[in-house]
Structure formats: C-alpha cells, structure tokens
C-alpha cells in the first residue's frame, strides 16, 4: 500500500552546536511500506523488513535505507592467474597408446618426468605454479598442456603477468631448442622437436574493480570511482574524505544525492554558511536590546 | 612394484670379459625400456646402453662396439655383455627400467633402479 507521510524539516546538530538543514520531502510523496507480522517500516530503495530492521541492498544504509552509503566494499581476488596453452613435441620418449590412458602406469611416468623437465625450465619464474598435461598423441609425443601463472593482486597484475608469459615463451622455445637429440639418444631429460614448440592459447584473470565499483554504485555510478591505497582499491564517493576525490565541504555535511555529492551547509550561532563547498561564512547581525 | 636385482659383477683383467644380469619383477619387458648404467668412484652416474620393446638399442660413445645389451623376455632377464674390458670401465653396474619407450641415457627419466653390482678391471 501507498502512504502519505508527513516530513518536516530535519536540523541536525553539529559538534559545535551548530545545525545543518536539509530539505524536507514533499508531504505527499509516495513510500512504499513493507508489513511483516504486525511490523510496518518504510524500507526504500528495495531494502526489506527483517522482522527488526530494514535490510538495505548496497549502496543504501540508514533506519528506511534511504542514505548513500561513502564507500561501497569491493574485493579483488587475493590471487590472480594466467593460463597458457601450450603443445611441445618429445622426441625422448616413443608414443605407445597407454599414454593416452591418464591411469596407466605410463602416462603417470610420463607426466612426473615432463613435470620435472618443466619444473627446472620455468624455475626462475616467481608466478609459475606448475603444468598440467591435457592430451599426449602420436608424433613422437605431441604433448599438450597447460602452463599455469599466479601473482598476488595488484593494481599491475596484468603487466605483471604478460610479462610472465614471455618469459615462458622464452624459455620453453630455447629448451626446444638446445635439448635435441644427437645420433637418436638423449642426453638430457627430456628431448625436443625445436619446431614442435607452439603456443595456442593465453588467458588471464580479468578483474577490473573500476566495472565493479560501477555495477554495486547502481544508479550512482556516475559518481563513484576507484582510489588505491596500499594497492588496495577502494570504492569511494566524494562524501568519503581522505581519498583524492573527497569533497570538502568546509562548514557542512557532504551527503550524495542522485545529481552527485553536494555539501549541505550548517548555521551556527554566529554564522550562516553558503556556496557549494560551504566556504562562505556570512555573519549574523546582532540587536541589542537596550533595558 | 618394479624390482631389479644385478649380478655378474667381481674383478676380472684388462682385455677380460664379463656378463652382467638383471632379473625383473613385474611385466617391464613386454613394454617400455630398460637400461645399464654404471657410476664410477667421485664420478656421476652415466649411461652406458638402452634397449627398449620395439627392439631399439642405443649404446654410449664410450663403450659402441665393445658392449652389447639384450634381453631374454621369457626369463624377465636383462643382460649386458662386456668385452675388451679396461681400466677406466671400474664401476658399479646399474640396471634400470621405465614403462616408456625411451631414448634417453640421462639417469634422470629413469624411474626404477636396482642396487647395483661391481665391477673392477685390474691386473
């Protein structure tokens, strides 16, 4: 159901005794109520009755959710990763068809030693976590696999991990290279076809906290935006101080509104306050009266 | 479980020969390879001759034409045959197996080992 409620002008008193005014709500402007029980609140903005409180969706708080929140909490992943598809030929090994069965006693053979062969060519790599082989087939062994990358979070990560990528790149085509066989033995580990040596795919975690910022802000998300600190991302809007963005609002309360942020100025015994930031102090005139 | 025993080994002269033998447990031979190794005093362990179940032989510079690998898969036997034997071949023998159809004498790609056995050529 549809109800009017009345609203008068909210003063709301600052630490120094001062008030701030802020505009009151059209007398007839519609609320929708939720009842739960014998419960009635006002929970605005989709929040819902939990039977005690309104229960506010992002980016709203407050007693009817009807305030923006200053910061919105948004979580990168701890870790972010890459993975490259890979297909390298071993010339060391001959295929038989138990290679192509994951649980026979051959392929497992065959996966330790390539694991290791792996291992020690990637091991100047700080994000390589490890292989994975996802099909051998004919050709001496045509071994296709995954080269899996992770980093910690940070604003760079995906420099970070294109730069690891290279790096494998260059490193799996100069062990193909130098780890041939000679007069059909190997000396090494593993052997290789240099030109067998292919990369097929690369793909790489994508968080963007700017696109997550903007999906929680819903209908503010004009007005939010991303600072780092720490390397930490932070959702912020204006009315949220210490960041870059902040608004300062010198004698007034920073509150957003769906225009943005703007400042709501206070009065205090000896002064009006006005302008967008509220910086312009305009003195009370005071009567005397004489006795 | 793959097992491996030598034997054969003990001192014999320069220019004297030797058969070493490697018994297996399990069912090696009728796939994958295996293999002699042998490892000197100070020295790392090195190849010395592969044979693997297509029949394939291979055989390190060192010892071509003087050693011969074969195998008799009905006994699980592995053997080596060592002629013209001299000095610088003193070490202790290793047979060695793997499920895989190797061409490899690096002691790495091999995954199971027997304890080898002695063998001394001196006068």
């Known amino acids: 159901p549809l109800a009017t409620i009345p609203v008068s002008t909210t003063s709301l008193t600052s630490s120094e005794g001062s008030t701030i005014s802020t505009p009151s709500v059209d007398i007839s402007t519609p609320v929708t109520t939720s009842i739960v029980g014998d419960q009635c609140s006002r929970c605005k903005n989709g929040g819902f009755w939990d039977g005690l409180k309104c229960q506010c969706l992002t980016p709203y708080y407050g007693e009817s959710c009807e305030e923006v929140v200053n910061s919105i909490d948004i979580a990168p992943p701890e870790t972010v990763s890459a993975q490259m598809e890979l297909t390298v030929t071993v010339t060391s090994v001959k295929f038989t068809d138990e290679l192509k069965n994951h649980s026979s006693q051959e392929f497992r053979e065959f996966n330790k030693t390539f694991t290791e062969q792996m291992n020690i060519v990637y091991s100047g790599i700080p994000e390589y976590v490890g292989v994975n082989i996802t099909n051998l087939r004919l050709g001496s062994v045509v071994v296709e696999h995954d080269v899996l990358l992770r980093t910690k979070y940070t604003p760079e990560y995906k420099t970070a991990l294109d730069n690891a990528t290279e790096v494998v790149k260059q490193k799996i085509t100069k062990v193909t290279t130098e780890q041939i066989m000679t007069n059909d033995n190997c000396s090494a580990l593993m052997c290789f076809n240099t030109t067998g040596t292919q990369v097929q795919n690369i793909t790489v975690t994508q968080y963007d906290p700017v696109e997550e910022c903007r999906q929680k802000a819903e209908e503010y998300e004009d007005y939010f935006l991303v600072e780092y600190r720490d390397q930490k991302p932070y959702c912020i809007s204006p009315c949220e101080s210490g960041f870059n963005a902040s608004k300062n609002c010198n004698h007034g309360k920073c509150q957003m509104s769906q225009n943005g942020a703007r400042c709501l100025c206070v009065t205090t015994e000896t002064h009006w306050y006005s302008g967008e930031d509220c910086n312009q102090g305009t003195q009370k005139s005071h009567h005397h009266h004489h006795h | 479980e793959v097992q491996l025993v030598e034997s054969g080994g003990g001192l014999v002269q320069p220019g004297g020969s030797l058969r070493l033998s490697c018994a297996a447990s399990?069912?090696?031979?009728?796939?994958?390879?295996m293999s002699w190794f042998r490892q000197a005093p100070g020295k790392e362990r090195e190849g010395v001759a592969i044979?693997?179940?297509?029949?394939?032989?291979g055989y390190a510079d060192s010892v071509k034409g003087r050693f011969t690998i074969s195998q008799d898969n009905a006994k699980n036997s592995l053997y080596l045959q060592m002629n013209s034997l001299r000095a610088e071949d003193t070490a202790v023998y290793y047979c060695?197996?793997?499920?895989?159809?190797?061409?490899?004498?690096?002691?790495?790609?091999?995954?199971?080992w027997g304890q080898g056995t002695m063998v001394t050529v001196s006068s």
């Open positions: 060695a197996a793997s499920f895989l159809v190797l061409r490899a004498l690096n002691p790495k790609a091999w995954h199971y």
């Open positions: 399990g069912n090696t031979f009728s796939r994958g390879s």
């Open positions: 044979i693997s179940s297509d029949g394939w032989t």
